[in-house]
Interface confidence: medium
């Protein structure tokens, strides 16, 4: 059973599984970066447990995380972004487990937004566009995007298209006529930074026309 350690019970605490994972978000709030960590075991009793990051920081040796329910969080400008940091789970000032992590290799981009689909009658295609906050960023500018779409009735039959731009054309002949489609997009760092897929954008829904039908913009 997972529990927290009293001061005299550190030996017992070390038997627990305190493995954790983290992701960073760069320039997530102006020039501020964030780092979010959480235990992999959702049943870990996090009372009295703290996270601390040391090394590869500007101006300070270490920073403590804030606890927000079951996650641990830092927002700061002080990430050096070259070099490995030591992230430790601590109780009563003693480290229970630590990981050396380069924050540039655990970047999770912000989710794309403003996803929309416009039908072009003359071209018989659908132009998918979306936006990403990363176009304005200094660091994580180069992303690969994963556009996923499916016919609404086909719950698990997602089609995926990877692209580096924020515009995609879907040919009408590759879609079923008179069908409702759901489409969404997510992003992952490409080039210098590494990491994880962003959250999915909100889904956009559009209907394909009948053959030879010619509506304008698809309404969600």
């Amino acid at each position: 059973e997972s529990g927290y350690a009293q001061n005299g019970d550190l030996e017992d605490a070390e038997l627990d599984d305190y493995s954790f994972s983290c992701y960073s978000q760069l320039e997530v709030n102006g020039s501020q970066h964030s780092l979010t960590c959480a235990f992999e075991d959702p049943d870990v009793n996090t009372t009295n447990l703290e996270f601390e990051i040391c090394g590869a920081l500007v101006e300070v040796k270490c920073l403590s995380f804030r606890k927000l329910q079951e996650i641990y969080f830092i927002e700061t400008k002080k990430f050096l972004l070259i070099g490995k940091s030591n992230i430790c789970v601590k109780v009563g000032g003693k480290s229970l487990t630590c990981k050396k992590i380069d924050l540039t290799t655990i970047v999770k981009p912000e989710a794309p937004f403003d996803l929309s689909v416009i039908y072009r009658e003359g071209a018989n295609d659908f132009v998918v566009t979306f936006n990403t906050s990363h176009l304005q960023k200094k660091y994580v500018k180069v992303l690969m995007h994963d556009v996923a779409y499916r016919q609404e009735k086909d719950e698990n039959k997602w089609m995926h298209v990877n692209l580096s731009s924020t515009k995609l054309t879907l040919l009408q002949r590759n879609l079923q006529p008179e069908a409702m489609y759901e489409i969404k997009v997510r992003s992952i760092p490409d080039h210098y930074f590494k990491g994880f897929w962003s959250e999915w954008s909100p889904s956009y829904y559009f209907r394909t026309p009948e053959i030879n039908n010619s509506p304008g913009e698809m309404d969600p």
Partner: antibody, heavy 121, light 109 residues
Amino acid sequence: EVQLVESGGGLVQPGRSLRLSCAASGFTFDDHAMHWVRQAPGKGLEWVSGISWNSRGIGYADSVKGRFTIFRDNAKNSLYLQMNSLRAEDTALYYCAKDEYSRGYYVLDVWGQGTTVTVSS
Amino acid sequence: AIQLTQSPSSLSASVGDRVTITCRASQGISSALAWYQQKPGKAPKLLIYDASSLESGVPSRFSGSGSGTDFTLTISSLQPEDFATYYCQQFNSYPLWITFGQGTRLEIK
């Protein structure tokens, strides 16, 4: 004991190439960025190039950009500087240096004794 | 790139003197500055990092101060072994870039 030992310097004609090596020991090499710093005779320190622990972050001084290439082999605990199209003004003592980012930001806390490069016809 | 300008370029002082060397950055660098000492024929040695933190093993007569653009290295009471050249150093993390000041030569008067 933490140690950096440079090698590969020598006398070379202008326009030719040379490769410097730096053998590291006594610390976890692949936790640290590494740098080359040079010092021309009677002059000050000039940073030449730096490389992050995983080789994804690389920088060069303007004076060597396009001519010098920094690379590392973490399996061999070694840092290298490939110097092409050498010029007389590249004549200097070349130091290999280890960064120590746990100090709060990049500082060069361990230096080798240097290897001399002389470019002359 | 950010430029670092040290002053004076050289100075003469006597054992026991209090000595101050300044380093000015062409733009604000917070406290991201280090100081090194170099003796003839030797590799540089780290003295101060993070503008004011003393490196382990460095005598307490050395101190650093400053933030933003203006930084100071002070030797409170000069010892014979302190006669050397001193350099300030700044970094930029993206892209990886380091800049040194031009150096200050401290000589015996």
